[in-house]
């Protein structure tokens, strides 16, 4: 189970047009349930109920997003329409080129995220949990478009924020 | 600030269909998702269905056959259609927002837009 | 689908009393229960959500309670501004169902 270094870049505008832009680092795991590999795309929070149904009619939201859920504890939500596996390859199937999961309340979903499959999906598959996964959700709390860069070994440069 | 404004036709013949706009301000779909509510006349509130970050979309299995929901990112509107109207669709119709970090219930809503559905 | 039972449709009481609702569920909905207020002729506003938790700029004098399928509303010290009525609701799974509503009127 390898460290996921996730960058998490915030877009903030100005009035006059120009904009700001946050970097925030955090780490997680790459699950075995995906592929051990870098990644990156806009944010999209993902409902727990929103990954239920399977729509073949529906289009694809796009590519190239990277799917964040917030797992609820086990006891809280004790009929899931899918396990955490299926939702992971739901969000695949609908576009997402990394999907994070915020393993917090949940721990149990680390093993079955862990358990070997014969069929991994091929996009990364990552699980954060206690003080990085707080920092991830006050980042999709800010209501700023983000986007998550997900890397296998540490970026280059510190986390700092920088004017554009 | 946050703001979702239902807008649509006041007054909608039987069989007909019904087209409502939402448009939102002060959040990002990515982050939430945005569903629909009614109310008729005098009674309580009905979800009708819900168009989530991702795009997709779930319904009332009741009304499934005539709803559709979708949106346009790009002009911060969600759409509405029933079709085949009948006059116990007459109401008001609700959009509002749900955070999808997690079980979150309706945290703001729309100011409505009445619809009567006559001949 | 998860049915909502809410009572009293109906009730009437003397400004600072305090006044309870209740909402049934048909089953356990693990404390994933809402209550909004709509005024007359406004939209309905978040009150309390997980059971308990008060929504941001929520008057401390409405509080909730209740597990498994049972569920109270109470508001302590009831005031003229609080005539509206009143809705529990089930967020966590389809169809998200609201319950059939209590309206509160001022003796």
């Known amino acids: 189970k390898e460290t996921a270094f996730v960058e998490v870049v915030l877009f903030e505008s100005s009035p006059s047009g120009d904009y700001t832009t946050y970097t925030t680092g955090l780490t997680g795991r790459f699950s075995r349930a995906g592929a051990t590999l870098s990644a990156e795309g806009e944010i999209v929070q993902m409902h727990p109920l929103g990954l239920c149904n399977n729509n073949d009619e529906e289009d694809l939201y796009e590519y190239g997003w990277v799917g964040v859920v917030k797992l609820e504890q086990p006891e809280l939500d004790p009929k899931p329409c899918l396990t955490v596996l299926g939702k992971a390859k739901r969000a695949v199937q609908r576009g997402a080129t990394a999907v994070i999961f915020d393993v917090s309340e949940n721990p149990e979903a680390i093993d079955q995220l862990n358990q070997g499959s014969e069929d991994p999906l091929k996009r990364p598959v990552v699980y954060v949990k206690g003080a990085d996964a707080i920092k991830l959700m006050n980042i999709v709390n800010k209501q700023k478009v983000a986007r998550a860069r997900i890397q296998h070994r540490p970026p280059r440069q510190p986390t700092e924020y920088f004017d554009m | 600030q946050v703001q979702l404004k239902e807008s649509g036709p006041g007054l909608v013949q039987p069989s007909q269909t019904l087209s409502l706009t939402c448009n939102v301000s002060?959040?990002?779909?990515?982050?939430?998702?945005v569903h629909w509510v009614r109310q008729p006349p005098g009674k309580g509130l009905e979800w009708l269905g819900v168009?989530?970050?991702?795009?997709?979309?779930d319904y009332n299995s009741a009304l499934k056959p005539r709803l559709r929901i979708s949106r346009d990112t790009s002009k911060s509107q969600v759409f509405l259609t029933l079709n085949s109207l009948q006059t116990e669709d007459t109401g008001i119709y609700y959009c509002?927002?749900?955070w999808g970090y997690g079980y979150n219930p309706f945290d703001y809503w729309g100011q409505g837009v009445m619809v009567t559905v006559s001949s | 689908d998860i049915q909502m039972t809410q009572s009293p449709s109906f009730l009437s009481a003397s400004l600072g009393n305090n006044i309870t609702i209740t909402c049934h569920a048909s089953?356990?909905?693990?404390?994933?229960l809402a209550w909004y207020q709509q005024k007359s002729g406004n939209a309905p506003e978040l009150l309390i959500y997980k059971t308990s938790s008060l929504q941001s700029g929520v008057p401390s004098r409405f509080s909730g309670s209740g597990s498994g399928t049972e569920y109270v509303l109470t508001i302590s010290n009831l005031q003229p501004d609080d005539i509206a009525t009143y809705y529990c609701q089930l967020y966590h799974s389809f169809p998200f169902t609201f319950g059939s509503g209590t309206k509160l009127e001022i003796k």
């Open positions: 509002n927002r749900m």
């Open positions: 002060g959040f990002s779909f990515n982050y939430y998702n």
């Open positions: 168009i989530w970050s991702g795009g997709n979309t």
């Open positions: 089953q356990d909905i693990k404390g994933w």
